[in-house]
């Protein structure tokens, strides 16, 4: 291919040549595919709003928890158990948290009057000891509450534990109270203020609209837009029991989903609230179930810093805001339509698949002979022939052979390796249908050419009886008119070919051979048809006429132009043409592959 290209190469357009098949079946299949695909494309376009440019939500959240709880605490004072009533308000049970979260305390364990000094550890498997050998000075166990002094001291009675430097008395290892001390937190309410923004669409809104009844409480069906939630209802929605979760604590997700259609003609932008338990409720005791943390209230007593340590159990509510805002965008629409156009090619792919399958050799040889109802599918072979043009790779070894006593053409695509071309079986190829329009272009003279001396004027049919083999004709010759090749030994086998497969009359004896191949008048006409002002000397003319005769024979016997290029002429025909249009001196070169 040339490296440079002219201006005319730029201004050109290529398109495919198509085959239109008039078929009720395939027409129905095509429209069925097109209707289904068109319906799906339109449905997806509308239902998923694929004509919109979508943008994720940007949001801010603010919460307010309301409610009062009465707590009945059991405390031990001077060895006597006492029940103490206290009231907890928002400031007592909520803690400032970062991000979109708020925390509600539901249970707690208190260790009062702690100060920094030496004291025995609380008895556990890891802190109990029988001698000082079980304690190590300076040792800090991750589970411990202080730094060991290396002494094993009496904790209570005959229990001895390692002494530590820590906040004393050490916090007891005990279970969270049951039921939870702030069980009534179930009735607390939380107001969630959520402002959202779609900067790309220049749109801002919030979940609390003007005119909202602020005494409402959220209900999934009766009041789904109310931003005030009762904590117990949140747990009921997820199928959990608030009282059970309140003992150890947990994490609850409040999901706010904004699916906003910002088109003027279908404007809709309201939140959908849903709830999800986020902590692992099946956690093993050893893996710290629930949700808890410790915090301390510090104070001074007699100038000694003391603290009350509180282990707080409660529920952390995480507010998860997500969603998208979409607005009509012509580019999105064009991109979507473009991406779906290829689906319309599925009909063609499917129909081509059917044609290719039903016209395969497998169907022809195994299915059609036995399955009568499959017979109508044979028409696919016709469609296939019209649709596809099969070409063989033009290898140097490619040759086509035509015997007058066989209806098909043989394709030989192998090296002969010393064997006569006559004896090589090759592959059977159907003979192309004759295009009689080509004949009509031949001169009228073809029909009234003067007879060649010594031959009768009427058309001769090939004689049925075999021609007696001449003494000179080679072993492979079946017509008795072939001559040995003059080519070197290595190339000779290529010319060892007769016009027949079985013994019989030679094709050169037919009237048509004489009129189509040997008629100087016809051949000169064909040469002038190609080059009107052709003027050649006798020898050159003979050469041109000889090669034109070869071409005429190949076109006549092989039909297809592609096959004619690789056609090998039988020896009898070759020598008959050479006799008519001889070379003044030198050898004949024989067949040369055109590529």
């Amino acid at each position: 291919m040339p490296a440079c290209c002219s201006c005319s190469d730029v201004f050109q357009y290529e398109t495919n040549k198509v085959t239109r098949i008039q078929s009720m079946n395939y027409g129905t299949i095509k429209w069925f595919f097109h209707v289904i695909i068109f319906s799906y494309v339109c449905f997806a376009l509308v239902s998923d709003k694929l004509y919109q440019r979508k943008e994720p939500v940007i949001s801010s959240v603010h919460t307010k928890v309301k409610g009062i709880a009465e707590v009945k605490e059991e405390i031990v004072e001077n060895g006597v158990k006492k029940l103490v009533h206290s009231v907890f308000d928002t400031a007592d049970y909520t803690f400032p948290l970062q991000g979109n979260s708020f925390f509600v305390m539901t249970n707690f364990l208190k260790t009062e009057g702690q100060e920094q000094r030496l004291c025995p550890e609380y008895p556990t498997r890891r802190t109990l000891c029988s001698s000082d050998r079980g304690c190590k000075k300076g040792w800090m166990d991750p589970q411990s509450k202080g730094i060991q002094t290396g002494r094993c001291v009496v904790y209570e009675g005959n229990q001895k534990t390692c002494e530590v430097s820590a906040w004393c008395p050490i916090e007891a290892v005990e279970e969270a109270p049951r039921p939870a001390l702030l069980n009534s937190a179930e009735n607390f309410t939380v107001l969630i203020k959520n402002n959202i923004d779609f900067p790309g669409h220049n749109y801002t809104t919030r979940n609390i609209l003007p005119g909202l009844n602020i005494t409402c409480t959220f209900h999934k069906t009766q009041n789904p837009q109310c931003p005030i939630f009762r904590l117990g209802d949140i747990f009921r929605e997820t199928g959990d029991n608030f009282s059970d979760v309140a003992i150890q604590g947990g994490i609850m997700g409040i999901e706010i989903y904004w699916d906003c259609n910002l088109d003027r003609w279908f404007h809709h932008c309201r939140p959908k609230y849903s709830f999800r338990r986020l902590d692992d409720k099946t956690t093993n005791v050893s893996l710290y179930p629930g949700y808890n943390f410790r915090y301390a209230k510090y104070y001074k007593e007699n100038n000694v810093e003391k603290r009350t340590l509180i282990k707080v159990f409660g529920i952390r509510f995480d507010i998860l805001v997500f969603g998208t805002g979409g607005k009509f965008d012509i580019i999105q629409l064009v991109v979507y339509i473009g991406s779906t156009l290829s689906y319309f090619g599925l009909a063609a792919v499917f129909i081509d698949f059917l044609i290719d399958t039903y016209s395969s050799n497998c169907c022809r040889s195994h299915i059609y002979p036995w399955c009568k109802c499959c017979q109508p599918c044979v028409v696919n072979e016709y469609y296939y022939r019209k649709k596809c043009e099969s070409i063989v790779e033009p290898k140097p070894t490619l040759k086509y052979v035509s015997f007058v006593d066989e209806s098909h053409i043989r394709m030989v695509n192998q090296q002969l390796l010393g064997r006569s071309l006559q004896d090589v079986k090759g592959q059977e190829v159907p003979r192309p249908a004759m295009d009689f329009t080509d004949l009509s272009r031949l001169p009228l003279a073809l029909h009234d050419t003067p007879p060649i001396p010594g031959q009768p004027e009427e058309i001769q049919l090939l004689r049925k009886e075999a021609t007696p083999r001449s003494r000179d004709s080679p072993v492979w010759c079946q017509c008795g008119s072939c001559l040995p090749s003059q080519l070197p030994e290595s190339h000779r086998c290529l010319e060892e070919l007769c016009c027949r497969k079985k013994p019989g009359a030679c094709i050169t004896t037919s009237e048509l051979f004489r009129k189509l191949v040997l008629s100087r008048h016809v051949l000169q006409f064909l040469l002038l048809y190609q080059e009107p002002l052709l003027a050649l000397d006798v020898d050159s003319t003979n050469s041109r006429l000889r090669h034109c005769a070869y071409r005429c024979y190949a076109t006549w016997r092989f039909g297809s132009q592609d096959m004619a290029d690789f056609a090998i002429l039988p020896s009898c025909c070759r020598w008959r043409i050479r006799k008519e249009f001889p070379k003044s001196e030198g050898q004949y070169s024989g067949f040369k592959s055109p590529y």
């Epitope: 109990l128 079980g134 190590k136 040792w139 050893s286």
Partner: nanobody, 129 residues
């Protein structure tokens, strides 16, 4: 949970040897520190030897140099090889296991009976003079 079964106890002459074995059931055996304790009639339970899940060992003062503890995690066994036995070694020997899944038992606490959650039924060792 882990079940422990001791074997190999019996009567032996002073100066002789004996090999006790503790077989443990449970797939997580390799996460346990294993110990041998003994209790002579009318006395406190006394530490003999222990081996942590990562192979460090500790011995009671009275058995150092004579007893050897090891572990075979493939067979879930903890053998105790007792050599140069003395009449004062006569006692019921108990095998014990301490879970180290959530934190290893510090070496200096391998001798503490409080660290061990699971105990075997014991095997009697009698050393005659």
């Amino acid at each position: 949970d882990v079940q422990l079964v001791e074997s190999g106890g019996g009567l032996v002459q002073a100066g002789g040897s004996l090999r006790l074995s503790c077989a443990a059931s449970g797939r997580t055996f390799r996460h346990y520190a294993m110990g041998w304790f003994r209790q002579a009639p009318g006395k406190e339970r006394e530490f003999v030897a222990a081996i942590s899940s990562y192979g460090s060992t500790d011995y009671g003062d009275s058995v150092k140099g004579r007893f050897t503890i090891s572990r075979d995690d493939a067979k879930n066994t903890v053998p105790l090889q007792m050599n140069s036995l003395k009449p004062e070694d006569t006692a019921v020997y108990y095998c014990a296991a301490a879970d180290e899944t959530l934190g290893a038992v510090p070496n200096f606490r391998l001798h503490e009976k409080y660290e061990y959650e699971y105990w075997g039924q014991g095997t009697l060792v009698t050393v005659s003079s």
